[in-house]
């Protein structure tokens, strides 16, 4: 699986999950954040050559395609496959406020 | 230049509700609050509620909690404000505001214009 | 919820002379060492405008002739040199606590 233990510890060049921190404050100016300060949201990025994890059939004739017609554009896109929330803390007013939000943090990917 | 621009004044029959848009522009719309605050004829301004757009968090007065529901579009950078079961007391121009940035409550530094709201049978 | 109260309603007050209107929340808006209170100039027809950010933190554009004070729950706004641009509702609002609440208003007009 193209997860965050196989893609964190290995040097992959093609598509797998890349770890990006973002702090709430510094880089998308939500200072009202209480905790956490920031968090792993990380990424998908990198090539997807025939048989990279496929998603559809979709996705791996595409693949073939791209690998049998190299100067061709069209090719299957790395994208994140299982995501989970973040809860975060927050204060409104004094009255402090839980939430959970949704599909917060990538921990693998996917060709698609 | 951040700018907050609201829908059309509005006349509603009791009972019935009411939705003001608040199109902003020349800022970053899911990195603030928005606000809605309601100013009756020659009264003092109460605050509604708040929205933070990114994933629709809500805080609500609960002066109206039940009948009012904030909602944002990310893609057209517009928030709205639904007001159910209508009445007399409701007759008042409506301003989404934008908050400052600091606090999820906090001062709000950019205003729309304001949507009067009429209520008559 | 926070009562805040302004005083006076309304007031008159010659041109060039400094006016002062007062805030007094019903209980403190400290935390943090912070005074969460800030004051609005509404004009007529217009809606309001931001003029002190916690307290005594002028807001951006706003002439320095407006300047804020206190902390706890006593405030006070004072705005030297008075112009006719000045004119209109003043108010007071606090987010200390939820929910957030504003001042009755103190209307100023010029003798």
């Known amino acids: 699986a193209l997860d965050t233990n196989y893609c964190f510890r290995n040097l992959e060049e093609n598509c797998c999950v890349r770890p990006l921190y973002i702090d709430f404050r510094q880089d998308l100016g939500w200072k009202w954040v209480h905790e956490p300060k920031g968090y792993y949201a990380n990424f998908c990025s990198g090539p997807c050559p025939y048989l990279r994890s496929a998603d559809t059939t979709h996705s791996t004739v595409l693949g073939l395609y791209n690998t049998l017609n190299p100067e061709a554009s069209a090719s299957p896109c790395c994208v994140p496959q299982d995501l989970e929330p973040l809860t975060i803390l927050y204060y409104v007013g004094r009255t402090p406020k839980v939430e959970q939000l949704s599909n917060m943090v990538v921990k693998s990917c996917k060709c698609s | 230049e951040v700018q907050l621009v609201q829908s059309g004044a509005e006349v509603k029959k009791p009972g019935a509700s009411v939705k003001v848009s608040c199109k902003t522009s020349?800022?970053?719309?899911?990195?603030?609050?928005m606000n809605w605050v309601r100013q009756a004829p020659g009264a003092g301004l109460d605050w509604m509620g708040q929205?933070?757009?990114?994933?629709?968090?809500?805080n609500y007065n609960e002066m109206f909690e039940g009948r009012v529901t904030l909602t944002a579009d990310t893609s057209t950078s517009t928030a709205y404000m639904e007001l159910s079961s209508l009445r007399a007391g409701d007759i008042a121009v409506y301003y989404c505001?934008?908050?400052?940035?600091?606090?999820?409550?906090?001062?709000?530094?950019?205003w729309g214009q304001g949507t009067l709201v009429t209520v008559s049978s | 919820d926070i009562v805040m109260t302004q005083t006076p309603p309304s007031l008159s007050v010659s041109p060039r002379e400094t006016a002062s209107i007062s805030c007094r929340a019903s209980e403190s808006v400290d935390s943090y060492g912070n005074s969460f209170m800030h004051w609005y100039l509404q004009k007529p027809g217009q809606s309001p405008q931001l003029l002190i950010y916690?307290?005594?933190n002028l807001e951006s554009g706003v002439s320095d002739r407006f300047s804020g004070s206190g902390s706890g729950t006593d405030f006070t706004l004072r705005i030297s040199r008075v112009e006719a641009n000045d004119t209109g509702v003043y108010y007071c609002q606090q987010n200390n606590e939820d929910p957030l609440t504003f001042g009755q208003g103190t209307k100023l007009e010029l003798k």
């Open positions: 505001a934008r908050g400052y940035g600091n606090y999820a409550l906090d001062a709000m530094d950019y």
């Open positions: 020349g800022y970053t719309f899911i990195t603030y609050w």
């Open positions: 916690l307290a005594s």
């Open positions: 929205i933070f757009p990114a994933w629709g968090s809500t």
